[in-house]
């Protein structure tokens, strides 16, 4: 039986049940290569409290559909008196990066995971030439996730004192230049994640090979190497390589530019101080507030919730968007879709789509940007579920009693973007991270 998601096969992936202090290792095409789980384990569970290992999915006992992967075992489990077998179930959804498997829940018999990934899309529009896992768990099982830094189009310019060259990078995947045919970036060879431009020539100085690594609690490392043979003539016989170290800052701050810290014989060392390198709980919340010791800030968007069935309305030329954030109030137009953002076609108001659901909410504050994300909306033709990204700006003089109003800024591949100026986005900082 052919592997259902070949892009995911090259790596052993990790997921964590934080509540129970359990680390899962997942290899969807082969075995995880952990002795304690046996030679054919595809999903190996490491209980750190009891220091025990259990195989909860066997690679030989795999069954797959386009959106679900199940690994059974021969181990019995007692579920309400019936003789079931322990199994793992991974539900796949279309995403814009390789993504990460997320632990959902576990019963006596079944360990459930969800994975939003390009590998599950109906079309190849989000697929990279080359992409590697872009997250890591530290020794305290806290997740550090650089997926939000991955650019689906374009690149980051590395700050370098050399006026004759420009070094462009992407994070964990190659640089896509198709959306900007006029720039210097266009000359970069396909597959490169680190592209050096000198004059009118562009050189591949690194492609992603291995996933993100953690070197210390707040330092993550990504390494790129030039795959193809044939040395570049300006590298003195050495093969080019790029090492990017992502550093979690010691206190809250605006984002910084990736900086070249060392360069010798085409070995480039880059340091990037960014809060995305911090553990995810420092940056994100499933509610509409971020506060307390954990996050070093106080943010509360709950006053933006609308009561009594009214919604914020944002004009999107062909569409109207109805938004009801930070609550679970049904939007009248949205046919009981549990939508936080609802898209209605102006020319045919029966065409209604959920552009993100209120149960699928993430509030993120990182590198000075405050963003509220709603995902899990109605599917587009690619298989990607519509989502909405609301970028908040602090405005102490916002109208509508300080609440302000969301403004639609555009759509990219079924992701709807809004900006929202409001006094409730004014962040209060604590200083003790």
């Amino acid at each position: 039986q052919a592997a259902p998601f070949p892009e995911l096969c090259s790596y052993t992936w990790e997921a964590v049940d934080t509540k129970n202090n359990v680390l899962y290792k997942i290899n969807i095409c082969g075995s995880v290569d952990i002795v304690q789980c046996g030679p054919s384990s595809a999903v190996c569970m490491h209980d750190l409290k009891t220091r025990t290992y259990h195989s909860v999915g066997d690679s030989v006992l795999r069954s797959a559909t386009r959106s679900l992967l199940e690994f059974n075992t021969t181990v019995s489990c007692d579920q309400q008196g019936t003789n079931h077998r322990v199994q793992s179930s991974i539900a796949f959804l279309c995403g814009k990066t390789l993504g990460t498997p997320e632990f959902v829940t576990a019963t006596e018999c079944v360990h459930y995971f969800e994975w939003r990934t390009t590998a599950a899309c109906k079309k190849d529009i989000f697929k990279a030439n080359k992409e590697v896992p872009c997250y890591v768990f530290d020794e305290e099982l806290r997740k550090h996730d650089l997926n939000p830094l991955i650019k689906l189009s374009g690149a980051y310019l590395v700050d370098d004192s050399d006026p004759d060259t420009s070094l462009f990078i992407n994070v964990c995947r190659d640089i896509d230049t198709l959306r900007d045919p006029g720039s210097q970036l266009r000359a970069c060879p396909p597959g490169t994640a680190a592209c050096l431009v000198r004059g009118h020539q562009a050189f591949d100085v690194g492609q992603p090979r291995d996933g993100l690594k953690v070197v210390r609690k707040d330092r993550l490392v990504l390494s790129y190497v030039r795959e193809e043979a044939g040395k570049l003539d300006f590298c003195d016989g050495h093969s080019p390589a790029v090492t990017i170290t992502f550093v979690c800052p010691s206190e809250r701050r605006e984002g910084t530019i990736p900086k070249l810290t060392a360069k010798s014989n085409c070995r480039y060392e880059i340091e990037w101080i960014t809060e995305y390198a911090c553990h995810r709980d420092y940056l994100e919340s499933k509610t509409c507030s971020l506060s307390g010791e954990q996050q070093d800030v106080s943010i509360d968007l709950t006053p933006l919730a609308q009561s009594g069935g009214s919604s914020y309305i944002s004009d999107g030329k062909e569409y109207l968007f109805y938004l009801n954030v930070c609550g679970e109030t049904e939007i009248q137009f949205c046919n009981k879709k549990q939508a936080a953002v609802c898209q209605v076609k102006k020319s045919d108001t029966s065409q209604v789509k959920a552009a993100g659901r209120y149960h699928n909410q993430t509030l993120r504050y990182s590198d000075g940007d405050l963003t509220l994300i709603y995902f899990g909306g109605d599917e587009c033709s690619s298989g990607f579920q519509r989502m909405s990204v609301i970028n908040f700006e602090c405005n102490k003089t916002a109208g509508n009693d300080g609440k302000g109003t969301p403004v639609f800024t555009g759509e990219v591949d079924c992701t709807y973007e809004f900006t929202w100026d409001t006094e409730y986005a004014c962040v209060h900082h604590h200083h003790h991270h």
Epitope: K151, L152, S153, G154, A155, Y156, L157, D159, S166, F168, T177, R179, D180, P181, G182, S183, Q184, L185, R186, E254, I257, P258, G368, D369, V389, N391, E393, T409, G410, V412, E417, T419
Partner: nanobody, 123 residues
Framework: QVQLQESGGGLVQAGGSLRLSCEAS????????WGWFRQAPGKEREFVAA????????SYADSVKGRFTISRDNAKNTIYLQMNSLKPEDTAVYYC????????????????WGQGTQVTVSS
């Protein structure tokens, strides 16, 4: 690719103000970063100011800091350059540009350009 059209240039006395506009049409991706550049006769095109579309993070050339302000109106797909306390050395053709490169002020990293609008500051 995105199309850009500048407007708002003209002749102004030193110390005066102008507001330039740049309207973006076509598929305006939110991944773009937007910039204003200028080119005086016989000189290279130079960076003036930049803004990210999805947030209001800005950067400015030292020569215009405190005098020029870049802003955006997402609803109108338009970016602006408010120029105050204008000096004769601000005389140039001003261009609006879009880039898919983050953290750049280098004109060669901008792939989409407007036609430019002339600003002349008389003493």
């Amino acid at each position: 690719q995105v199309q850009l059209q500048e407007s708002g240039g003209g002749l102004v006395q030193a110390g005066g103000s102008l507001r330039l506009s740049c309207e973006a049409s076509g598929r305006t991706f939110n991944t773009y970063n937007w910039g204003w550049f200028r080119q005086a006769p016989g000189k290279e095109r130079e960076f003036v100011a930049a803004i990210r579309w999805s947030s209001s993070k800005t950067s400015y050339a030292d020569s215009v800091k405190g005098r020029f302000t870049i802003s955006r109106d997402n609803a109108k797909n338009t970016i602006y350059l408010q120029m105050n306390s204008l000096k004769p050395e601000d005389t140039a053709v001003y261009y609006c540009a879009a880039s898919i490169v983050d953290f750049t002020t280098n004109p060669s990293h901008f792939g989409s350009w407007g036609q430019g609008t002339q600003v002349t500051v008389s003493s």
